[in-house]
Every structure is written in structure tokens, then in C-alpha cells.
Interface confidence: low
């Protein structure tokens, strides 16, 4: 606010006042009178730039008059009291109320004193973020969506992620006149590595004290990615039982595991137990290629592993999963 002038009456008011759509707002306006200065205020007037006539007048003897009596009210001015506070309350703010207003004091003997105030009409947006569930497409697709509904002015949306990706933002008029709905899509080539990771949508708006952060957990549907673990190329005759595990990552979860060999069904020494395969002790060398086939709702994938059981005494540390 401007400092009061020295030796002169000065009108004090903020240069800008924010108000919310549908709410009420007070446009503050005061007359600063230096000590020992004799000032008589005969009238308070509010006018809007670009419009002829006054929107609100408070006269020292006639009291208040308004262009829209249901929407305007002098907050502090009273008949019979010194007119020093011209603050005006506006009810039911509309988009078209945004603009420049002049607050004017008619004083004697100093003459008229005025100040301009910019009324800014804001609407606080509602923000939502949601995942766009996708399959492996091989090309960039929207994987998350962030919507800021009914903001005035439009909200700013940005994305934060260590996965890369590209924002694509658009705007459409909001439900209430003068408001804007902003939609931002976060676009990336889907991969299994992205599934379950988070991206954050940041929404900034001048009605927020701080940016709103909305986290989206990404979903990528993909067929199983399969590998077999538990074999160290170091299995010997006479060794205890060993276990192989069919490791599968997929979304949705695997629905079935099927073990076989390149020659057909499993040999007697191999017993399937879901994702695991129990290898029993054998008495002659073996060289077999095992296959684990994993199914989920999107398809089936398999992994192969060639297992050799060799002659020769097992060393102290040979084999894995030994009992």
C-alpha cells in the first residue's frame, strides 16, 4: 500500500484485491488525514472504469445509494459520523466484476482524492489425477491424466518423474462461465519397468498457498517375463535334492506355471510344484533342457535352462539349494 503523503490527505488502498467467484469481497479504501489537518468529507464515490455513472455513493446527508443495492454495501460509512472509510463490500462475485475500480473522496478544502483498485475474480480449481491403464504398445501413449477443473485463471499443470515422458496439456471452458478446466496427459512408451512406478502431477494456482501434488501409480499390462534360477552349472551325481525356481514378472499376475522339457514331459527325477521344480538325486549323468511356461491373461511366455548332472564327487560348496 502506498505510504501516506506528508502534509496532504491521501487515499490508501491495495492496488489489487482478489475475490472468489460466487463469494463476497471487500474493496478496502481509507482516507489518511495528517494530524492537525482540517478535512471535511462530503461524499464517497465508487465507479468502475469504462462505465458512466457511479456504482455506489455515500453522501454526508443523504446516506448510501447503489446501482445494484442487493450486491453492494458500504462497510463502515455511517450518517452523522466522519467519513474516513469508504470500503465497499460486493456480494455474489461474477466473472464480469473483474476490472478496475476507482474509490473517490470528495473533501473540503483539499478537493477530490482517488485511488484505483484492480478486482481480480478467482475460482479455486478442483484437482484430480488418475492412471490410464495401458498395454505394451511400442509407441508413446497417455499413461496418467491430471485434471484441474473450474479454475480462474487456468491452473498450471506440470509433471515430475524420473521416467522421462512428455506432457500434453489442453484447456476447455469450465462449467461456470469464465472458468477453465485444464487437462494434462503424461505420455510415455509403456514398458514392464514402468509398471508400479509413480509420477507426480503438480498443480499451481494463485488461489493455492502451495502447489498441490497428486501422485499416480502407473499400470502397464504385459505378458510374463520369465527366467529360471537355482542352477549354478555345478551339479554332481550323489548330490542331495535341488530346487529350480521359475521367476515370472507379469501384470496381471501369472495364472499358471507349466514345466516340461524339449523332449516332452518331465522325466521322473523332476517334480513340478507350481513355480518350483524339485530335482531328485539321480544315479547316472543327465543333460536335459527344462522349459518353464508361464501364462497370464495376456498370453504365455517361456524360459529354457539346460541342466547337467555330472560324474565326480561334489565339492564342499557345489550345487545350490542343497539340503
Amino acid at each position: 500500500w502506498p505510504p501516506p503523503g506528508t502534509g496532504d490527505v491521501v487515499v490508501q488502498a491495495p492496488t489489487q484485491v482478489p475475490g472468489f467467484l460466487g463469494d463476497s469481497v471487500t474493496l478496502p479504501c481509507y482516507l489518511q488525514v495528517p494530524n492537525m489537518e482540517v478535512t471535511h468529507v462530503s461524499q464517497l464515490t465508487w465507479a468502475r472504469h469504462g462505465e458512466s455513472g457511479s456504482m455506489a455513493v455515500f453522501h454526508q446527508t443523504q446516506g448510501p445509494s447503489y446501482s445494484e443495492s442487493k450486491r453492494l454495501e458500504f462497510v463502515a460509512a455511517r450518517l452523522g459520523a466522519e467519513l474516513r472509510n469508504a470500503s465497499l463490500r460486493m456480494f455474489g462475485l461474477r466473472v464480469e466484476d473483474e476490472g478496475n475500480y476507482t474509490c473517490l473522496f470528495v473533501t473540503f478544502p483539499q478537493g477530490s482524492r482517488s485511488v484505483d483498485i484492480w478486482l481480480r475474480v478467482l475460482a479455486k480449481p478442483q484437482n484430480t489425477a488418475e492412471v490410464q491403464k495401458v498395454q505394451l504398445t511400442g509407441e508413446p501413449v497417455p499413461m496418467a491424466r491430471c485434471v484441474s477443473t473450474g479454475g480462474r485463471p487456468p491452473a498450471q499443470i506440470t509433471w515430475h518423474s524420473d521416467l522421462g515422458g512428455m506432457p500434453n496439456t489442453s484447456q476447455v471452458p469450465g462449467f461456470l462461465s469464465g472458468t477453465v478446466t485444464v487437462t494434462s496427459l503424461w505420455i510415455l512408451v509403456p514398458s514392464s519397468q514402468v509398471d508400479g512406478k509413480n509420477v507426480t502431477c503438480k498443480v499451481e494456482h494463485e488461489s493455492f498457498e502451495k502447489p498441490q501434488l497428486l501422485t499416480v501409480n502407473l499400470t502397464v499390462y504385459y505378458p510374463p517375463e520369465v527366467s529360471i534360477s537355482g542352477y549354478d552349472n555345478n551339479w554332481y551325481l550323489g548330490q542331495n535334492e535341488a530346487t529350480l525356481t521359475c521367476d515370472a514378472r507379469s501384470n496381471p499376475e501369472p495364472t499358471g506355471y507349466n514345466w516340461s522339457t524339449t523332449m516332452g514331459p518331465l522325466p521322473p527325477f523332476a517334480v513340478a510344484q507350481g513355480a518350483q521344480l524339485l530335482i531328485r538325486p539321480v544315479d547316472k549323468p543327465i543333460n536335459t533342457t527344462l522349459i518353464c511356461n508361464v501364462t497370464n491373461a495376456l498370453g504365455a511366455r517361456q524360459a529354457e535352462l539346460t541342466v547337467q548332472v555330472k560324474e565326480g564327487p561334489p565339492s564342499e560348496h557345489s550345487g545350490i539349494s542343497r539340503n
Partner: antibody
């Protein structure tokens, strides 16, 4: 009042690196992205990239990947941009700014590679 | 990358004139455009954001308009302090890109 204080002018040799700084005052440093912009008479204003100091997440213009590295020190509310393997093409004025909802830019750092 | 083609490069004007600068985006950027003013030897200062919203403290002789691909900055009643270079910038997509600038000079 928002202020962005950038480090002073630099005169450096080709092939070396330089680290420019931008100290933010008057707002919550971790809440707003810090963008870096290059300005030359030939190419005008070019966006280099941005860092979100709160999370450390960065985004770069492909053109400046490998050339610029953005970092931020939350404790001192300072953003940094390191430019590597400098050539005369890197001579420019470099600005930092929280760009979108704020009007404020740093005063700029003039870099001369010669 | 989105190209922002700004015209004209130079513009001669007199105090009190009305001038317009245009920016054309190579693809739809909704209303995600900022206009900057840069005076000689100074940093850029943002005037308008979201294509048509004035920043607080910017005189109302500066007006922004447009959406999609075509944007305009209009200065009505040009003042001597408005002599500067003006840039547009889109923030719909990374990388953010700027127009090449329009220099406003006195006739």
C-alpha cells in the same frame, strides 16, 4: 519480494567447464521449478531445462543434454547449472527463473568462452 | 519441438499508437502462452500468461489474445517506456520454446 541472485560474469577457455549459480530469495525454493534459459543474438532465447528442487527431478531440452547439468542445494536455496566441454557456441547470457506463475528472472550471467 | 513463429521482427511506432505482435505455433498449444518484454541490458519480464491474463502490475494497455495456434499481443496507446523487445513462449510441451522476438522502435 522474490529475488534471484545469479553469479558474476565468467571468462573461460574452450574445453573447460563452468558452474553457474542462482540463489533464490523471498519464496519457498523447494515448491517451484527453476528453469534455465540461454540468450544469444543469433538464436534468441532457448530453454535449457528445469529442476524441481524439492524432488531433484530434472527435464532437459534434447539440444542441451550432455552439455548442461542442473542441480539444486535445498539448504542454501541455490540452483546450479554446470556447462561442460565449452566452445565459443556456449558464449551467451544465461538466466534462471521460476518461469510460470512468477514474473521474476535473475539478472543473468554472461559467459564468454575464448 | 513446437516452433513459435513471431512477426514482425521490427516495428516502428510513435507514442500513442496501437501496435500488435503475432505469434504462430506449429501445433495446437491451447492457451499455454506467455508474453515477455525485454528492455536493453535487462532480464525479460513476463507481461501476460495463459495467453490473455495480465500479471499483477502490468498496465492494462497490454492485452493478450488467442488460443490454439494463433496469438497476439496488443499495446494500445504506446508509451516511450514500452520501447523494448517482445517475445512469446509456449509451455504446452517440453521443450519450452520461444518466438524470435519483435523489436519495438520509435519512428
Amino acid at each position: 519480494e522474490v529475488q534471484l541472485q545469479q553469479s558474476g560474469a565468467e571468462l573461460v577457455r574452450p574445453g573447460t567447464s563452468v558452474k553457474l549459480s542462482c540463489k533464490a530469495l523471498g519464496y519457498t525454493f523447494t515448491d517451484h521449478e527453476m528453469h534455465w534459459v540461454k540468450q544469444t543474438p543469433v538464436h534468441g532465447l532457448e530453454w535449457i531445462g528445469t529442476i524441481h528442487p524439492g524432488s531433484g527431478v530434472t527435464a532437459y531440452n534434447q539440444k542441451f543434454k550432455g552439455k548442461a547439468t542442473l542441480t539444486a542445494d535445498k539448504s542454501s536455496s541455490t540452483a546450479y547449472m554446470e556447462l561442460s566441454t565449452l566452445t565459443s557456441e556456449d558464449s551467451a547470457v544465461y538466466y534462471c527463473t521460476p518461469l510460470w506463475l512468477r514474473r521474476d528472472w535473475g539478472q543473468g550471467t554472461t559467459l564468454t568462452v575464448s | 519441438d513446437i516452433q513459435m513463429t513471431q512477426t514482425p521482427k521490427f516495428m516502428s511506432t510513435s507514442v500513442g499508437d496501437r501496435v500488435s505482435v503475432t505469434c504462430k505455433a506449429s501445433q495446437n498449444v491451447a492457451t499455454n502462452v506467455v508474453w515477455f518484454q525485454q528492455k536493453s541490458g535487462q532480464s525479460p519480464k513476463a507481461l501476460i500468461y495463459s495467453a490473455s491474463y495480465r500479471y499483477s502490475g502490468v498496465p492494462d494497455r497490454f492485452t493478450g489474445s488467442g488460443s490454439g495456434t494463433d496469438f497476439t499481443l496488443t499495446i494500445s496507446n504506446v508509451q516511450s517506456e514500452d520501447l523494448a523487445e517482445y517475445f512469446c513462449q509456449q509451455y504446452n510441451n517440453y521443450p519450452l520454446t520461444f518466438g524470435a522476438g519483435t523489436k519495438l522502435e520509435l519512428k
